[in-house]
């Protein structure tokens, strides 16, 4: 059979190196030789290129070499396939060399901040050695922070007269390391060069960019003063490397700004003992380059009523994330503070907190929480300077089977009845939310039975048992991940009751 007609011809001019054309050869059953026929010098000259490789992958490509390639030029390219049964020609294709030129990538040799200009780095590069002198070059510069995987791009052209091979990349984060790569293309071409080798550069350090401030209100003490734990952290989006030398805090009663107290600390939290009235707390962080903007927080008076607006809240795990959703009756509330900490019997030392805006849900990556630990999660509505009543739930980022089953007892043994009681599994052993208990019981040598009850029930009465019979009973506690049996207990029903 005749060879298949070569299709999808594509040509690239690797500038000042070679012109390579490739095509789809079709399914060849016998040895096929390909000849690429070109006309060049604006139709004045023609020549051929013949594939001589025996492997099918290499046979679908052929190259023409210098010196018989000059730009600008128009080519026609036609591919002939030949086997023992004959010859078949492709369609004639037409190419302008300028449109298919591909250069070497540029070489970045310096990425540096410019003294005194904030949030900017200057990229300097060398044009590809083999690039048309007579053409403007287009560039795409891509950049990302070192700890990110997503690239951002800027595009620009450099006119052929332009001696200055630099670009000022602005609008960056301060004191942040960036990864930079550059590619270029001849103005008329549809082919980009490959990306240059990546180069790192860092923006200049600045004064801290801000703080987020939160508080934990504790019950008033006997003297009427109330301990308030102030917590703060770098504002979201602050540079990872941002340095802070310390914090200035000042606070005063809402009714009297003259009673301002000030203090300094290098810690990330502070315990204040405030009176029963409402207070304003303000703070800044500072480093050798200056101060951050002021963060302020209002502490309500002890007797102040806080508003309520969260009606329902639920947590679920979806795609490696713990998702908390809530419904609010207040349409004007669009900022929320989320608090979460492990539910352990000791006082929480590791309180985490984060604000959410323009949403009534919050997500956290599963791996940021300990698996099999119960977390208390509270959501506070925030409206202007007021903080509303929180809504709290418990949730696990990842559930497991309980590490031990319930401790079980048998009570009120009768002729045909018995009461099985069990204790809640200690928090540390639950590994998940206990969703139900299952009581398994079986007469000696008889058939087994089971009964499942919800997690709020800690006892169950078995009925219709056989008199004077030995039974074995066991209670299983289950989470969404599975169940664990407690120890099995033996008991024997009575032969008769006092009423008989």
């Amino acid at each position: 059979a005749l060879p298949a007609k070569p299709e999808n011809i594509s040509c690239v001019y690797y500038y000042r190196k070679n012109l390579t054309c490739t095509w789809s050869p079709g399914k060849e059953t016998s040895y096929t030789q390909y000849t690429v026929k070109r006309t060049y010098a604006f139709g004045e000259k023609h020549d051929n290129c013949t594939t001589n490789s025996s492997t099918s992958e290499n046979r679908a490509s052929c190259s023409f070499f210098l010196p018989r390639i000059t730009i600008p030029d128009n080519y026609t390219i036609e591919v002939e396939a030949e086997n023992g049964d004959g010859v078949i020609k492709s369609h004639m294709t037409y190419w302008r060399l300028e449109n298919i030129a591909k250069t070497e990538p540029p070489k970045i040799f310096r990425v540096k901040p410019v003294l005194g200009i904030k949030r900017m780095i200057q990229i300097e590069w060398i044009k590809p050695e083999l690039a048309p002198v007579s053409s403007d070059l287009k560039y795409t510069l891509r950049f990302r922070t070192v700890n990110s995987t997503s690239w951002m791009e800027v595009n620009f052209a450099k006119n052929r007269k332009d001696k200055n091979q630099t670009y000022n990349l602005t609008g960056l984060q301060p004191f942040t390391e960036y990864v930079i790569a550059l590619r270029c293309a001849v103005k008329e071409s549809k082919f980009w060069s490959d990306w240059s080798q990546e180069k790192m550069g860092m923006t200049e350090e600045e004064a801290p960019c801000g703080l987020e401030l939160w508080r934990v209100l504790k019950p008033a003490e006997a003297d009427g003063r109330r301990p308030v734990r102030l917590l703060w952290k770098k504002a979201r989006g602050a540079p990872v490397l941002e340095k802070t030398l310390g914090y200035n805090i000042w606070y005063y009663p809402e009714s009297n700004t003259n009673l301002t107290e000030t203090m300094n600390t290098t810690n990330q939290q502070l315990e204040l003992h405030l009176g029963g009235e409402s207070f304003w707390v303000s703070m800044i962080s500072y480093n050798s380059l200056g101060k951050s903007p002021v963060a302020t927080l209002r502490i309500p008076a002890i007797q102040e009523k806080s508003f309520q607006c969260i009606e329902v809240m639920q947590a679920c795990v979806a795609e490696d994330q713990l998702v908390v959703k809530w419904q609010s009756s207040a349409l004007d509330v669009n900022t929320w503070m989320i608090e979460w900490f492990p539910d352990v019997d000791s006082e929480p030392t590791t309180l985490s907190w984060e604000s959410v805006s323009q949403a009534t849900n919050w997500t956290i990556q599963q791996d940021k929480l300990k698996p099999f630990w119960c977390y208390n999660i509270s959501v506070y509505p925030m409206l202007h300077d007021k903080v509303g009543e929180p809504y709290s739930i418990q949730a696990y980022a990842k559930e497991g089977v309980p590490s031990e089953g319930p401790e079980t007892k048998v009570e009120n043994i009768g002729v045909k009845t018995v009461t099985i009681t069990w204790k809640e599994i200690p928090k540390s052993e639950r590994k998940g939310i206990i969703c139900n208990y299952t009581i398994f019981y079986q007469a000696e040598g008889g058939k087994g039975f089971s009964k499942t009850v919800n997690s709020s029930i800690l006892q169950y009465g078995l009925e219709s048992l056989k008199r004077k019979t030995s039974y074995i009973v066991q209670v299983m506690a289950s989470t969404s991940a599975g169940g664990t049996n407690g120890t099995s207990i033996n008991f024997k029903t009575l032969s008769f009751s006092v009423f008989e």
Epitope: K138, K190, W192
Partner: antibody
């Protein structure tokens, strides 16, 4: 032939987020091109907002600071615009348009969708 | 950013006239300049790319010229369907910017 259709809410309240979808038919958004959002204000002024390229890289107009985000769903052949903290100044007709990555012009435009920001 | 300035803001012409619309860039943008036409209630349509390259399907009466910072869109013999707003676009440097437009009216 590539065709584009913008969709999203026609009315958004100030301070909320504006979210628009561009559905592309006739071409895969992961094959080639940079997929742009451009808006036109009531006085006819045009503003390029940003793009997401076929490879997933993004480019944004610095004038929109950090308010703008362009993402995509390759399984649905859609790309999205999110503009946060909108004001009445963001009232405009929003267009999506592809751009050959080596040719920085827009030869195909969607029909546009009008968004009004008002309380 | 490169600022694109178009003049005049409005142009009233008679059918058959030859008209010239001007666009000036705040920096040298070589010939990375593109022209669009927008008719009432329609999306913009590309007319000319790279200052002077024609686009298939666009009538030959539309032509462009210029390089550096001064550009001109010419309509050889205006027809009534040419009414609309004409925009130039900087395709040279990020971010892409558009001129304020020239409105073409028929007297």
């Amino acid at each position: 032939d590539v065709q584009l259709r913008e969709s999203g809410p026609g009315l958004v309240k100030p301070s909320q987020s504006l979210s628009l979808t561009c559905t592309v038919t006739g071409y895969s958004i992961t094959s080639d091109y940079a997929w742009n959002w451009i808006r036109q204000f009531p006085g006819n002024k045009l503003e390029w907002m940003g793009y997401i390229s076929y490879s997933g890289s993004t480019s944004y107009n610095p004038s929109l600071k950090s308010r703008v985000s362009i993402t995509r769903d390759t399984s649905k052949n859609q790309f999205f615009l999110q503009l946060n903290s909108v004001t009445t100044e963001d009232t405009a007709t929003y267009y999506c348009a592809p751009m050959i990555t080596t040719d920085w012009f827009f030869d195909v435009w969607g029909a546009g969708t009008t968004v009004t920001v008002s309380s | 950013d490169i600022v694109m300035t178009q003049s005049p803001a409005t142009l009233s012409v008679t059918p058959g006239d030859r008209v010239s619309l001007s666009c000036r860039a705040s920096h040298d943008i070589s010939d990375f300049l593109h022209w669009y036409q927008q008719k009432s209630h329609e999306s913009p349509r590309l007319l000319i790319k790279y200052a002077s390259q024609s686009i298939s399907g666009i009538p030959s009466r539309f032509s462009g010229s210029g390089s550096g910072s001064d550009f001109t869109l010419s309509i050889n013999s205006v027809e009534p369907e040419d009414v609309g707003v004409y925009y130039c676009q900087n395709g040279h440097s990020f971010p892409w910017t558009f001129g304020g437009g020239t409105k073409l009216e028929i007297k």
